[in-house]
């Protein structure tokens, strides 16, 4: 129907436009007219797929009309101007606004020209990560929790860890209708080696320029793991005093150290000083097994060490450790 040999006019618009829940968004739509082409626009129409009627119309003489006047506005179209820009602003975006929209120009002599635009309604989630403090259960339990609240679409959560383990992720409706809260747990069998180590929760979402990384320092509560150090099997008579140290790893921290021997209380040459045991010089050989008992809130554990003080110094004394 247009005159033969004319270049065609084109409606330009993005195929998809993102907008945030509660915010406003502009659906851009322009009529591109080739240099030598002439066109006359008399109406601009916006309609939504699946809905009856048009939601916004700009008429050459009647001006703008809207199905929801408080939520819609032609950005640039004005009476008495060339109607080449049909861009429409939508206010107070709702979840139900997501969908396909048609922008249409009624032109002469080319006729009607339209384009479809997909409006995506997004909601930026809030992300938190927290430790799940655990004890030695002997079975897999959550040790960290990562929550992405109120995202649309749902956020994608992954974990990065050198400790082994596996994720358990679930979704629930967010506070605002149409939004989703994603909760992801990092699950492993707790051990003392895990305590104090970190895992990282990575949250990805369309609304983020880059993924958000949240690091969690793990907490595993465990009773003391005890060992005694300071003895090198080369202690001899008539040498300086030496020290044994009760090395304890625990969470929470140890609340008490108790030294004893397999025979009962400490002999006179052994003096307890908290985590350390002072061994004074002796004048006759000894063969004593010392016990260090360490207590924390979860219980008590002990370690034993047999110390021998032998006769005759070596050619190069390396015996009882000097203070």
């Amino acid at each position: 129907w247009p005159p033969p040999g004319t270049g065609d006019i084109i409606v330009q618009a993005p195929t998809q436009v993102p907008g945030f829940l509660g915010d406003s968004v502009t659906l851009p739509c322009y009529l591109q007219v080739p240099g030598m082409e002439e066109t006359h626009v008399s109406q601009l129409t916006w309609s939504r797929h699946g809905e009856s009627g048009s939601m916004a119309v700009f008429h050459q003489t009647q001006g703008p009309n809207y199905s929801e006047p408080k939520r819609l506005e032609f950005v640039a179209a004005r009476l008495g101007t060339e109607l080449r820009d049909a861009s429409l602003r939508m206010f107070g975006l709702r979840v139900e606004d997501e969908g396909n929209y048609t922008c249409l120009f009624v032109t002469f002599p080319q006729g009607s020209r339209s384009v479809d635009i997909w409006l995506r309604v997004l909601a930026k989630p809030q992300n938190t990560a927290e430790v799940q403090k655990v004890q030695l259960t002997g079975k897999p339990v959550p040790v960290a929790r990562c929550v992405s609240t109120g995202g649309r679409p749902p956020a994608h959560i992954t974990w990065h860890s050198d400790l082994g383990g596996m994720p358990n992720t679930s979704q629930a409706p967010g506070f605002l209708s149409g939004t989703v809260t994603v909760t992801s747990l990092w699950i492993l069998v707790p051990s003392s080696q895990v305590d104090g180590k970190s895992v990282t929760c990575k949250v990805e979402h369309e609304s983020f320029e880059k993924p958000q990384l949240l690091t969690v320092n793990l907490t595993v509560y465990y009773p003391p793991e005890v060992s005694i150090s300071g003895y090198d099997n080369n202690w001899y008579l008539s040498q300086n005093e030496a020290t044994l140290t009760c090395d304890a790893r625990s969470n929470p921290e140890p609340t008490g150290y108790n030294w004893s021997t397999t025979m009962g209380p400490l002999p006179p040459f052994a003096v307890a000083q908290g985590a350390q045991l002072l061994i004074r010089p002796v004048d006759k050989p000894i063969n004593t097994t010392f016990i260090c008992n360490v207590t924390n809130a979860l219980g008590a554990r002990q370690a034993e060490l047999t110390v021998q003080v032998k006769e005759g110094p070596p050619s190069e004394p390396s015996g009882m450790s000097s203070n």
């Epitope: 129907w1 008399s42 048009s54 050459q60 003489t61 006729g111």
Partner: antibody, heavy 116, light 107 residues
């Protein structure tokens, strides 16, 4: 006030041509497309074609197979519709109508009678 | 060409009645539909554009609805001065086409 005033009735013989005028006032002539629509007595409306006065672009209903020519005279804000090779079935009231996607203002109509 | 089929072709109703005229397009015309009122001996007068928007000055008892292929003109409370013929028209694609008309009489 927008007004479209058409020329008077015409009686034509088959094979002849007729040229109907439509003088406009009350608006800027070059800002609106002008179309022509006809209505045989007691029948429905039929779109003939239209023109944009600014550059003279036209669009015609193919049914009229080159028999119709729409023109304008910008100096007098007048639109014209000429229909040639008239036949009896062309007898109708011919309207000019200002186009805004729909037709918002119409002339009073011109009766063209084709009869031998 | 797109056919616009109007129904009924004629009807009579009483003052105060609710009157509905329908128009069916032979293919999708979006919302590019106008409705006109033509009183005897006069040219048509535009009532509705873009399927559902009233021209300024048109009484609010006239309303239009629909999109795609099915359209309706409703007169919520018929008045004596509404005696006329009513036409729908599509302007989605050339050639622009009209319905055959609905003649409305007052009982």
């Amino acid at each position: 006030e927008v007004q479209l005033v058409q020329s008077g009735s015409e009686l034509k013989k088959p094979g002849a041509s007729v040229k109907v005028s439509c003088k406009t006032s009350g608006y800027t002539f070059t800002e609106y497309t002008m179309h022509w629509v006809r209505q045989p007595h007691g029948k429905g409306l039929e779109w003939i074609g239209g023109i944009h006065p600014n550059q003279g672009e036209t669009s015609y209903n193919q049914r009229f197979k080159g028999r119709v020519t729409i023109t304008v005279d910008k100096s007098t804000s007048t639109a014209y519709m000429e229909l040639s090779s008239l036949r009896s079935e062309d007898t109708a009231v011919y309207y000019c109508a200002r186009w805004t996607g729909d037709f918002d203002y119409w002339g009073q109509g011109t009766l063209v009678t084709v009869s031998s | 060409d797109i056919q616009m089929t109007q129904s009924p072709s004629a009807m009579s109703a009483s003052v105060g009645d609710r009157v509905t005229i329908t128009c069916k397009a032979s293919q999708n015309v979006g919302t590019n539909v106008a409705w006109y009122q033509q009183k005897p001996g006069q040219p048509p007068k535009a009532l509705i554009y873009s399927a559902s928007y009233r021209y300024s000055g048109v009484p609010d008892r006239f309303s239009g609805s629909g999109s795609g292929t099915d359209f309706t003109l409703t007169i919520s409370s018929l008045q004596a001065e509404d005696l006329a013929e009513y036409f729908c028209q599509q302007y989605q694609s050339y050639p622009y086409t009209f319905g055959q008309g609905t003649k409305l009489e007052i009982k």
